[in-house]
């Protein structure tokens, strides 16, 4: 008796974070023996969709022509071969941006900071929100969440960084969200360029979790240090 069928691979193109109204294609790749592919969405009572495999039968395409709130969520896919159904794929989290108005991102005391000093990035929303996300462009682990402790809604979140090094330099954006669906984000803030000027000593940040030795500076997760912000928000790594 052969073991269970290998699980398929699930991904989204052009990516899993999609602006409202834009198109996205979800791909499920299984094996050449697949007869049918099925996509399930968390909390959807019926199979979300099913498709014939595309030749040479090892994958299927699920098209979303225009992204809306209804499509945001967590997906898994399966395939059926002559011997039965595969294991489920790892989940794909499809996030929609543009659900709320854009927050404002600023740097205190300034976006021009000397290496070794401190800076705080401040993300402010017009209406109260309970989740704020800071994203650094071209980072492999771009999301840092600050989420309200008890559902208390905030107008802002602080992301302190200390000590600042050259690794922290770059372009940042922030998003805000409501806790009832972390798959729905605001429009992105306008970009903020954080410029780190050199000093005699340029201390490297000491990562608080392991990072692949093959990773360059841009692949390291954003790691602000210091105390949890006084805003009542709790830090969450994603």
């Amino acid at each position: 008796q052969a073991g269970p069928l290998p699980k398929p691979t699930l991904w989204a193109e052009p990516g899993s974070v999609i602006s409202w109204g834009n198109s996205v294609t979800i791909w499920c790749q299984g094996t050449l023996e697949a007869r049918e592919y099925r996509l399930d969405k968390e909390e959807s009572p019926a199979p979300w969709d099913r498709q014939n495999p595309l030749e040479p039968k090892n994958k299927a395409r699920f098209s979303i022509p225009s992204m809306t709130e209804d499509y945001a969520g967590r997906y898994r896919c399966y395939y059926r071969s002559p011997v039965g159904w595969s294991q489920p794929s790892d989940p794909l989290e499809l996030v929609m941006t543009g659900a709320y108005s854009k927050p404002t991102l600023s740097a205190l005391p300034s976006p021009l900071v000397t290496s070794g000093k401190s800076v705080t990035l401040l993300c402010q929303s017009r209406s109260p929100m309970d989740t704020f996300l800071l994203i650094k462009e071209r980072a492999a682990h771009p999301l840092l969440h600050l989420r309200s402790e008890h559902g208390a809604q905030q107008h802002q979140a602080e992301f302190p960084m200390s000590p600042v090094t050259s690794v922290h330099g770059g372009t940042y954006r922030c998003f805000s969200s409501h806790g009832f669906s972390h798959y729905l984000l605001s429009h992105p803030s306008d970009p903020l360029e954080l410029i780190v000027s050199g000093s005699l000593e340029d201390p490297r940040p000491s990562p608080t979790r392991s990072v692949s030795t093959a990773a360059g500076p841009e692949d390291q997760p954003l790691m602000p240090t210091g105390s949890v912000p006084h805003s009542g928000l709790r830090r969450h790594w994603e």
Partner: antibody, heavy 120, light 107 residues
Framework: QVQLEQSGAELVKPGASVKLSCKAS????????MHWVKQRHGQGLEWIGE????????NYNEKFKTKATLTVDKSSSTAYMQLSSLTSEDSAVYYC?????????????WGQGTSVTVSS | DIVLTQSPSSMYASLGERVTITCKAS??????LSWFQQKPGKSPKTLIY???RLVDGVPSRFSGSGSGQDYSLTISSLEYEDMGIYYC?????????FGAGTKLELK
């Protein structure tokens, strides 16, 4: 008990459109895909397409892609099929049929059918 | 699309007789086959799914068998109410396709 109640017979002119309905009761409408099947007078059965009532996702038989449009109204547990640019070839009885189970794409319950006659 | 060939296209049988109808697929359909009964002026009634599984409420005189490309429906002892047209359906692949039907009449 499961029931699929389809709308009454239609007499329509060539080139016109018609919208057929299928009202479901006796089960949770959004939990099962709905199929539509065509049967020309005294002939066999042809699968037109299917719709997921929970999200409106559809799959069509290539042959009917430009002919049929499937929709649902969750609030009334009703599935609809619109047929456009009708010709005499579209004169038939149309059935809705409930998908059997989450993991099995058979059809179990069928509506009583709607007769569509295309004639000038 | 997968083609289903049913045979015979029509047949006569006596009450109490054992009746077998066959359905051959143009390719392996992995037992994703269903059987329906249709009476004149009525909608189809599902009898069997997944080649051999009886739908709730269908009399046990009906049975299905087969695998790969070849399938059959058997009525162990024909009753008057069994007259009608029988169709097979494959749902291994989109689009599902039906056989042309077998008309069963009383001898």
């Amino acid at each position: 008990q499961v029931q699929l109640e389809q709308s009454g017979a239609e007499l329509v002119k060539p080139g016109a459109s018609v919208k057929l309905s299928c009202k479901a009761s006796g089960y949770t409408f959004t939990n099962y895909w709905m199929h539509w099947v065509k049967q020309r007078h005294g002939q066999g059965l042809e699968w037109i397409g299917e719709i997921n009532p929970s999200n409106g996702r559809t799959n069509y038989n290539e042959k009917f892609k430009t002919k049929a449009t499937l929709t649902v109204d969750k609030s009334s547990s009703t599935a609809y099929m619109q047929l456009s640019s009708l010709t005499s070839e579209d004169s038939a009885v149309y059935y809705c049929a409930k998908n059997y189970r989450y993991d099995d794409w058979a059809m179990d319950y069928w509506g009583q059918g709607t007769s569509v006659t295309v004639s000038s | 699309d997968i083609v289903l060939t049913q045979s015979p296209s029509s047949m006569y049988a006596s009450l109490g007789e054992r009746v077998t109808i066959t359905c051959k697929a143009s390719e392996d359909i992995n037992s994703y086959l269903s059987w329906f009964q249709q009476k004149p002026g009525k909608s189809p009634k599902t009898l069997i799914y997944r080649a051999n599984r009886l739908v709730d409420g269908v009399p046990s005189r009906f049975s299905g068998s087969g695998s790969g490309q070849d399938y059959s429906l058997t009525i162990s002892s024909l009753e008057y109410e069994d007259m009608g047209i029988y169709y097979c359906l494959q749902y291994d692949e989109i689009p599902p396709t039906f056989g042309a039907g077998t008309k069963l009449e009383l001898k």
